[in-house]
């Protein structure tokens, strides 16, 4: 969490941002909140990006003002106009690109004063893994697949029964470049699995960590997966 205060002028207002990560090809949110004002027409929101000459987005006098918007953001940004009055200056970003990564500044002016806060935005690709029993294999084998990751992640297998065991000798992981030539499909195969055990396939890069679990018994197979973004710090 980054909290910024205005330093110029007589008054300062608190502006709060949260570091976040964007999944390339999907929409992202750059979070920013501020002390609200009673009049929408008195609020100015400016989003800036370090190293970019034009503005990312500007909202003032109750409407978007995009005449100074940088070319890389045209048609790709929007504030939640109906929520500005309650102090939400968050920015929606369409079709996140790798090049959107960087340091952003949320700069606010209201009748109470000015304030700003920076936000670190990481971009990459992350997706939920799915673990299945590979019935085509000669021995009992598990196959963990996740369709989109970038940068290249690490894959680690773990088991509930053999806690702390190293499965690197009995697993094989491959990375296949997807058609857009950036993200990769992750496939990891675990051999010689035993029934009545829960196995976890953990995929991690510097942006996200995802886990796919599978519990194999004689009577049923249970699956579960979850994904967690790393380094979500508020400012």
């Amino acid at each position: 969490l980054i909290i910024g205060f205005g330093i110029s002028g007589r008054h300062s207002i608190t502006v709060t941002t949260v570091a976040s990560a964007g999944n390339i090809g999907e929409d992202g949110i750059l979070s920013c909140t501020f002390e609200p004002d009673i009049k929408l027409s008195d609020i100015v929101i400016q989003w800036l990006k370090e190293g970019v000459i034009g503005l990312v987005h500007e909202f003032k006098e109750g409407k978007d003002e995009l005449s100074e918007q940088d070319e890389m953001f045209r048609g790709r940004t929007a504030v939640f106009a109906d929520q500005v009055i309650v102090g939400n200056a968050s920015l929606r970003l369409k079709n996140v690109q790798l090049t959107d990564a960087g340091t952003y500044k949320c700069y606010i002016i209201t009748s109470k004063g000015k304030g700003n806060a920076n936000l670190e935005y990481k971009t990459g690709a992350f997706s939920m893994p799915e673990v299945n029993v590979d019935y085509n294999a000669s021995s009992e084998t598990l196959r963990c697949e996740a369709p989109r990751w970038f940068p290249q992640p690490t894959v680690v297998w773990a088991s509930q029964v053999d806690q702390g065991a190293n499965f690197s000798e009995v697993s094989n992981t491959s990375f296949e470049l997807n058609s857009e030539n950036v993200t990769m499909k992750v496939v990891s195969v675990l051999y010689n699995v035993t029934i009545n055990n829960t196995y976890s396939c953990m995929i991690e890069n510097d942006i996200a960590k995802a886990t796919g679990d599978i519990k194999v018994t004689e009577s049923e197979i249970k699956r579960r997966s979850h994904l967690q973004l790393l380094n979500s710090k508020a400012s």
């Epitope: 090809g25 999907e26 929409d27 034009g54 987005h57 409407k63 978007d64 003002e65 995009l66 005449s67 100074e68 918007q69 070319e71 045209r74 048609g75 790709r76 940004t77 929007a78 929606r92 369409k94 079709n95």
Partner: antibody
Framework: QIQLQQSGPGLVQPSQSLSITCTVS????????VQWIRQSPGKGLEWLGV???????DYNAAFLSRLSFSKDNSKSQVFFQMNSLQADDSAIYYC?????????????WGQGTLVTVSA | NIVMTQSPKSMSMSVGERVTLSCKAS??????VSWYQQKPEQSPKLLIY???NRYTGVPDRFTGSGSATDFTLTISSVQVEDLADYHC?????????FGSGTKLEIK
């Protein structure tokens, strides 16, 4: 009330240029981009390009060498020009405004300019 | 270019019936699909944007759904005034593209 009013010729000679003016009201050209779309019986709706609030443009690559957009923010006017028209450019040409600045759909359309390319 | 394929090409329905129109994208377009109604000699009118958001003033019998590649426009109880062509379009990536349309006729 948001409106887009188009003006331009109906008949264009082959190999000549087409110019259309789209005059907008109810919103500012510094807040929203203006899209250009055409519709012909053979090809349906076809996106031609957009002029953004900043004045920068994006064109459909299929028409890149023939298209040019400009605008006058103070007069709330957007100008469309297409060169070297041929018979298959006969269509209804529309200007339109996005529903949001993030371009999720075209909420407001001009009345259209019916263009016939014929000698 | 992303190809938007609409089906059926045309359909004839009775008043009060439920109508389902389909639009499929050749690549993932997130939720950047919009639906338009066009009556003869008129400009297209926006019905749905962002795949599922009903535009201001559009009757609630019109519903949009879907994401990624498969999208649907549903008219829960078709009315005589719904006689029109319906177009879907994607605004996810350049060039923006449209489907070839579905003509809805009323029996």
């Amino acid at each position: 009330q948001i409106q887009l009013q188009q003006s331009g010729p109906g008949l264009v000679q082959p190999s000549q240029s087409l110019s259309i003016t789209c005059t907008v009201s109810g919103f500012s050209l510094t807040s929203y981009g203006v899209q250009w779309i055409r519709q012909s019986p053979g090809k349906g709706l076809e996106w031609l390009g957009v002029i953004w609030s900043s004045g920068s443009t994006d064109y459909n690559a299929a028409f890149l060498s023939r298209l040019s957009f400009s605008k006058d923010n103070s007069k709330s006017q957007v100008f469309f020009q297409m060169n070297s028209l041929q018979a298959d450019d006969s269509a209804i040409y529309y200007c339109a405004r996005d529903v949001t600045t993030i371009v999720e759909g075209f909420a407001h359309w001009g009345q259209g300019t019916l263009v016939t390319v014929s000698a | 270019n992303i190809v938007m394929t609409q089906s059926p090409k045309s359909m004839s329905m009775s008043v009060g019936e439920r109508v389902t129109l389909s639009c499929k994208a050749s690549e993932k377009v997130g939720t950047y699909v919009s639906w338009y109604q066009q009556k003869p000699e008129q400009s297209p009118k926006l019905l749905i944007y962002g795949a599922s958001n009903r535009y201001t003033g559009v009757p609630d019998r019109f519903t949009g759904s879907g994401s990624a590649t498969d999208f649907t426009l549903t008219i829960s109880s078709v009315q005589v005034e719904d006689l029109a062509d319906y177009h879907c379009g994607q605004t996810y990536s350049y060039p923006f593209t449209f489907g070839s349309g579905t003509k809805l006729e009323i029996k």
